[in-house]
């Protein structure tokens, strides 16, 4: 809203004159412009003890314009206001003040925070995260086969990032250990290079894992009766519950 100022006239006239320069329609030597050419805004500038009329293409900083039928006039905003809609409503405050609902404040009210970019008081925004995703498949070194103990991960998204005074965001991923029924990798799941080395290593790992756990999870291909199967399933459920309790305490979280 800063003005591209019409040059104030140099050659003043003792009485009201029509021969004015710089946007004035009428002027006097004591008060400067008295009225302006069409579409220009009339503003009174205080110079020492007297007020001088000036004609501008728009109102200067700290003033607002009113287009009356007979004159376009600039009126002062409140002292702490740089741009205003009218006397009551500021739209941009002077440096060091924050705008809140049309008023200029030196600090923001309770529950609001200062945005130092817009110099406005804004609502505090807290972090919002989505629900957790389902747990990923149990994996080890990027594979879902050839092992017994692995890790599974779940993630969530940040839906709303917090403002300066808002609550921080929670972790966006969680990892926990998992135990699966060991299954051999099919040909497609093994890399060509060092396949033998990997097979030997896996066999060694499998032997170790089998010996360290009483839960062989049906590696043998023995035939079981329905009663045996039912009994086995019951035991496995009990073990799974115990494992889940244990896993809750070994969760690893990563903050985004």
């Amino acid at each position: 809203q800063n003005a591209s100022r019409g040059r104030r006239q140099r050659r003043m006239h003792p009485n009201v004159s029509q021969g004015c320069q710089g946007g004035c329609a009428t002027c006097s030597d004591y008060n400067g412009c008295l009225s302006c050419k069409p579409r220009l805004f009339f503003v009174l500038e205080r110079i020492g003890m007297k007020q001088i009329g000036v004609c501008l293409s728009s109102c200067p900083s700290g003033y607002y314009g009113t287009r009356y039928p007979d004159i376009n006039k600039c009126t002062k905003c409140k002292v702490d206001c740089d741009t205003c809609f009218n006397k009551n409503f500021c739209t941009k405050c002077k440096s060091g003040f924050y705008l809140h609902l049309g008023k200029c404040l030196d600090s923001c009210p309770e529950g609001l925070e200062a945005n130092n970019h817009t110099m406005e008081c804004v609502s505090i925004v807290h972090c919002e995260a989505s629900e957790w995703s389902p747990w990923s498949p149990c994996m080890k070194k990027g594979k879902t086969c050839g092992f017994k103990r692995g890790t599974e991960t779940r993630v969530r998204d940040i839906l709303q990032h917090p403002s300066a005074k808002g609550n921080l965001c929670p972790p966006t991923s969680e990892t926990r250990t998992c135990i699966v029924q060991r299954k051999k990798c099919s040909k497609g799941e093994r890399g060509k290079k060092g396949r033998e080395r990997k097979r030997k290593k896996l066999n060694k790992e499998e032997r170790k894992e089998t010996s360290s756990s009483s839960d062989s999870k049906g590696l043998e291909s023995s035939i079981e009766t329905p009663d045996q199967q039912e009994n086995k399933e019951r035991q496995q459920q009990q073990k799974r519950r115990a494992r889940d309790k244990q896993q809750k305490s070994v969760s690893v979280s990563t903050v985004h």
């Epitope: 009113t66 287009r67 039928p69 007979d70 809609f85 009218n86 006397k87 009551n88 409503f89």
Partner: antibody, heavy 116, light 107 residues
Framework: EVQLVESGGGVVQPGRSLRLSCAAS????????MAWVRQAPGKGLEWVAT????????YYRDSVKGRFTISRDNSKNTLYLQMNSLRAEDTAVYYC?????????WGQGTMVTVSS | DIQMTQSPSSLSASVGDRVTITCLAS??????LVWYQQKPGKAPKLLIY???RLQDGVPSRFSGSGFGTDFTLTISSLQPEDFATYYC?????????FGQGTKLEIK
């Protein structure tokens, strides 16, 4: 607290006169341009007249020019509307309002009925 | 004079609905637009000035937008107290003109 209280409304015959008053308090009356806005029964808002803060200039809608006169007394914080040669179409609730580009403060209104 | 055209002239909606009222100016008025709310038997109340600025005390479910000739008033989630008549007014030129009003009724 800002208050604008209108008075002087009533039932009047066509061609007769009425004078409305508006007493202001709770703000610096002499800093504000003041206006009268009316609303005919079941109709929308219609600006009638405005007087600038120091009383030196007045503006009217075409349909009331020459019949209505807006004035103010800043020493009494009071706005007036002198209505002459009233017509049936002037029937409305008349609101006084502080007019600074927008109408920031309003009175509760006074009803003027022009009927024979 | 600048003509202001509001649409729709009346609107039925339910509590919780999102409602939009539009106001069209006959010439460019920059952002010099004001919205008022009026309830039966009461004086109008200023809601929004400078097209998008909320007046102190007005709930944040009210918002205004637009520039030039096209303006909108939006109520994001209607509350029972929002059923009223809404008016736009141009403040670009001093002789003020209002839209004809939009009456918001309960469906």
């Amino acid at each position: 607290e800002v208050q604008l209280v209108e008075s002087g409304g009533g039932v009047v015959q066509p061609g007769r006169s009425l004078r409305l008053s508006c007493a202001a308090s709770g703000f610096t009356f002499s800093d504000y341009d003041m206006a009268w806005v009316r609303q005919a029964p079941g109709k929308g808002l219609e600006w009638v007249a405005t007087i600038i803060y120091d009383g030196s200039r007045t503006y009217y809608r075409d349909s009331v020019k020459g019949r209505f006169t807006i004035s103010r007394d800043n020493s009494k914080n009071t706005l007036y509307l002198q209505m002459n040669s009233l017509r049936a179409e002037d029937t409305a609730v008349y609101y006084c309002a502080a007019h600074d580009r927008s109408f920031d403060y309003w009175g509760q209104g006074t009803m003027v009925t022009v009927s024979s | 004079d600048i003509q202001m055209t509001q649409s729709p002239s009346s609107l039925s909606a339910s509590v919780g609905d999102r409602v939009t009222i539009t106001c069209l100016a006959s010439e460019d008025i920059s952002n010099d637009l004001v919205w008022y709310q009026q309830k039966p038997g009461k004086a109008p109340k200023l809601l929004i000035y400078a097209a998008s600025r909320l007046q102190d005390g007005v709930p944040s479910r009210f918002s205004g937008s637009g520039f030039g000739t096209d303006f909108t008033l939006t109520i994001s989630s209607l509350q029972p107290e929002d059923f009223a008549t809404y008016y736009c007014q141009q403040s670009y030129k001093y002789l003020p003109t209002f839209g004809q009003g939009t009456k918001l009724e309960i469906k």
